[in-house]
């Protein structure tokens, strides 16, 4: 009797179990009672990444420099091209179809994690004892100056945006 289900890496067509095409190849002709499935390799700019019965290969992703993209990994007949962003930019989404500049951490915030080609800068509020007085994509919160180690006293308290101001100790006469 004709099969109703086929083995792994096969597909059912016209009551025949035909072999799927291997990754990197597309279907040219279904098998028959007398012939195997016929497959052809994808061209240089195309790929198929699974066992398949596709009659067309997929185009490799284009890393458009106008969108801030560059090639991270060149595609093969079995894999798509992987794009990443130019220096100072990161992907807008998981599919990385375009890039945006890294976010800067405002004064009062420091960089917790520096941005990569695929992730934005992560900022954190400067805790007590630390400050940041610049807007930066790479500077962490810095500790307040320790006046004591310089034999000075705090003349003006620090904030999350400003350092302490040290001054000479008042000498009792």
């Amino acid at each position: 009797e004709p099969p109703t289900a086929c083995r792994e890496k096969q597909y059912l067509i016209n009551s025949q179990c035909c072999s799927l095409c291997q990754p990197g190849q597309k279907l040219v002709s279904d098998c028959t009672e007398f012939t195997e499935t016929e497959c052809l390799p994808c061209s240089e700019s195309e790929f198929l990444d699974t066992w398949n019965r596709e009659t067309r290969c997929h185009q490799h992703k284009y890393c458009d420099p106008n969108l801030g993209l560059r090639v991270q990994q060149k595609g093969t007949s079995e894999t798509d091209t992987i794009c990443t962003c130019e220096e100072g930019l990161h992907c807008m989404s998981e599919s990385c179809e375009s890039c945006v500049p890294h976010r800067s951490c405002l004064p009062g915030f420091g960089v917790k994690q520096i941005a990569t080609g695929v992730s934005d800068t992560i900022c954190e509020p400067c805790p007590v004892g630390f400050f940041s007085n610049v807007s930066s994509a790479f500077e962490k919160c810095r500790p307040w100056t320790s006046c004591e180690t310089k034999d000075l006293v705090v003349q003006q308290a620090g904030t999350n945006k400003t350092d302490v101001v040290c001054g000479p100790q008042d000498r009792q006469r």
Epitope: S29, T32, E33, F34, T35, E36, E38
Partner: antibody, heavy 112, light 112 residues
């Protein structure tokens, strides 16, 4: 229903070229199957001569050397056989076949 | 070329009795994908060959279930479980794993 029908002269002179056509109905000749020519001399076993594929490429029996040509006319959904320099040993019933479906066969006699 | 040797050449059978035909190949008919393209045909007197079994053991549509095929590698068998009057004719095996495709010499089944 797939049907194949051979046509061509039943008598060919020695050294001439035998020409037969196979009209296919009920199925497009441009899809997956191979389209074969097979012959059967009187009271003898079947001999595969060659096939033409859906894409126009073909394969021939080496025993027929350079005498055989199989071509396809997709606009008429038919394929043809040419066998040159025939002799009496080429006398046979000639079948066109998809292998699961066959024509009824046509007897070609090579004689002067 | 692959040589297919059929036996017996002639097979007299009583109606309702089983029949068995052997086809031996000069080399393995299993291809690199694990498929074996060995087929069985029936040719009734004055008719074209008719496909019975493809890929060793698959009955073609419309073929009665008294016909079955088995075997692997180089050794294949066609069995008829209970012979009927309409089964009279010549039975051929055909391999399409290797080019050129080749037929067995045929087994003539007749009623005793």
């Amino acid at each position: 229903q797939v049907q194949l029908q051979e046509s061509g002269p039943g008598l060919v002179k020695p050294s001439d070229t035998l020409s037969l056509t196979c009209a296919v109905s009920g199925y497009s000749i441009t899809t997956n199957y191979y389209w074969n020519w097979i012959r059967q001399p009187p009271g003898n076993k079947l001999e595969w001569m060659g096939y033409i594929k859906y894409d126009g490429s073909n394969n021939y029996n080496p025993s027929l050397k350079n005498r055989i040509t199989i071509s396809v006319d997709t606009s008429k959904n038919q394929f043809s056989l040419k066998l040159s320099s025939v002799t009496a040993v080429d006398t046979a019933v000639y079948y066109c076949a998809r292998l699961d479906y066959w024509g009824q066969g046509t007897l070609v006699t090579v004689s002067s | 070329d692959v040589v297919l040797t059929q036996s017996p050449l002639s097979l007299p059978v009583t109606l309702g009795q089983p029949a068995s035909i052997s086809c031996r190949s000069s080399q393995s008919l299993e291809n690199s994908n694990g498929n074996t393209f060995l087929n069985w045909f029936q040719q009734r007197p004055g008719q074209s060959p008719r496909l019975l079994i493809y890929k060793v053991s698959n009955r073609f549509s419309g073929v009665p279930d008294r016909f079955s095929g088995s075997g692997s590698g180089t050794d294949f068998t066609l069995k008829i479980s209970r012979v009927e009057a309409e089964d009279v004719g010549v039975y051929f095996c055909l391999q399409v794993t290797h080019v050129p495709f080749t037929f067995g010499s045929g087994t003539k089944l007749e009623i005793k």
